[in-house]
Interface confidence: medium
């Protein structure tokens, strides 16, 4: 007999990464039928929801209207059908963004390269801060770490044209609370097609679009959320 | 602003070999590659290779590997091509053009006649 | 190498008309495409990049777009500085190749 049902999708809209003061809405994802919703902060209850007509609703919406260092950190949720309980969820990480200050990206040798070259990107933020994160935008959240004191940096190695594209990089106060985002860095390498058929470009954003640049990452975000919740719970870790 | 001015016009003899230049201004040197692009008379455009200036690193279409070798000097902010053992197949303009934010041949320089005669 | 195919080879057309030039891609090269004109002096200068985007300071008049595998310059309104040669140059894989280019001739 079944103890508990199926954890259900979560995922945060627009996006994981969220301007300091703008909104975001926190989604949960269960079963028709399901009677309760809660949204658990941290590892405690945070908000709950009962969807009305249970039987024709099988998501729900935790809407947050106003970021802040304080809301950022890791969510689940969890649901009811009956008496049954369902497992929780993955853990959603909900960054905040637009923290204090805005670090400066640069890459060595350059931004045009050939490939087989090597390539370093270079975060600088002169506040206190040790932890770097560098994101290439794109069809895939692409995310590397660094370390050091107001510096990191990133060697790519040995590129190749799947390295084309537009990197930002943000400077970290904690796992979840980021600088604004650097001014966009973007790589041309000339070289050879990895494959034989081409995949689309990475598409690029202008600044002021970046904190919802995600919605087109993954394929079918808003069909599969599967793929957003492994993003959101594979970043940070 | 960017500009690429190439030498001038070469007349050469058969199995000879001969140098063009393509001096940079306008931006740091080092940054952005340089291609290479023949043109022969009344004809289309081809692609000869690439030089990364920062580096030294280059890739050539392999057609004009042995032909076509691509060098530069950070100190003078200038590019060359050397085409070696030349024949009358090597008369043609060659351009060089520079890539840019925004992807690829964003700037070209006037272009260098070199003219293959005994 | 990638075979760039462009049509057509010659065209002649009258003053404040709208044309046309198109290149096919024999294999998928995503975005990465430019066209380019080329003055009597042999001066080259680039008018769109990445298939659609226009080069700052180039006429409105001057658009691209992409149907599959088929890229197309299209110029809504020639002008008498305008029939000269155009050419498309694919970037997505090296070697980088052209297409065989087309003389805008005036009628």
């Known amino acids: 007999q079944q103890q508990t049902l199926p954890k259900p999708f979560i995922w945060a809209e627009p996006h994981f990464m969220v301007p300091k003061e703008k909104q975001v809405t926190i989604c949960c994802q269960g079963n028709y039928g399901a009677v309760e919703y809660q949204l658990h902060f941290e590892g405690s209850l945070f908000a709950v929801d009962r969807p009305k007509p249970p039987e024709r609703i099988n998501k729900v919406q935790f809407y947050i209207p106003d970021m802040n260092s304080r809301m950022a950190g890791q969510y689940s949720c969890i649901y009811r059908v009956g008496e049954l309980w369902s497992e929780p969820s993955n853990l959603l990480d909900l960054v905040v963004t637009e923290m204090y200050d805005t670090p400066t990206l640069s890459v060595h040798p350059g931004p045009e390269v050939i490939s087989g070259e090597k390539v370093t990107f270079y975060c600088r933020l002169d506040t206190a801060t040790s932890m770097f994160l560098l994101l290439k935008e794109g069809r895939s959240s692409h995310v590397q770490r660094g370390y050091g004191k107001v510096q990191a940096e990133f060697p790519l190695g040995p590129v190749t044209t799947a390295h084309r594209g537009t990197y930002r990089c943000f400077g970290s106060y904690n796992n979840h609370a980021w600088s604004f985002p650097s001014e966009p860095v973007k790589l041309l390498v000339t070289g050879d097609i990895e494959n034989t058929s081409l995949a689309p470009e990475d598409p690029t954003f202008p600044a002021d679009t970046w904190g919802t640049y995600l919605l087109t990452t993954e394929t079918g975000l808003q069909k599969d959320h599967a793929l957003w919740d492994h993003t959101a719970q594979n970043l940070l870790r | 602003q960017v500009q690429l001015q190439q030498s001038g016009a070469e007349l050469v003899r058969p199995g000879t070999s001969v140098k063009v230049s393509c001096k940079a201004s306008?931006?740091?040197?080092?940054?952005?590659?340089i291609d290479w692009v023949k043109q022969r008379p009344g004809q289309g455009l081809e692609w000869i290779g690439v030089i990364n200036p920062g580096s030294g690193g280059t890739k050539y279409n392999e057609k004009f590997q042995g032909k076509a070798t691509l060098t530069a000097d950070k100190s003078s902010s200038t590019a060359y091509m050397q085409l070696s053992s030349l024949t009358s197949e090597d008369s043609a303009v060659y351009f060089c053009?520079?890539?840019?934010?925004?992807?690829?041949?964003?700037?070209w320089g006037q272009g260098t006649l070199v003219t293959v005669s005994a | 190498d990638i075979q760039m195919t462009q049509s057509p080879s010659s065209l002649s057309a009258s003053l404040g008309e709208r044309v046309s030039l198109t290149c096919r891609a024999s294999?998928?090269?995503?975005?990465?495409l430019n066209w380019l004109q080329q003055e009597p002096d042999g001066t080259i200068k680039r008018l769109i990049y990445a298939t659609s985007s226009l080069d700052s300071g180039v006429p409105k008049r001057f658009s691209g777009s992409r149907s599959g595998s088929d890229y197309s310059l299209t110029i809504s309104s020639l002008e008498s500085e305008d029939f000269v040669d155009y050419y498309c140059l694919q970037y997505a894989s090296s070697p980088y190749t052209f297409g065989g280019g087309t003389k805008l001739e005036i009628k």
């Open positions: 306008g931006y740091p040197f080092t940054s952005y590659l």
């Open positions: 053009a520079r890539g840019g934010w925004d992807g690829k041949f964003t700037y």
């Open positions: 294999q998928d090269i995503g975005s990465s």
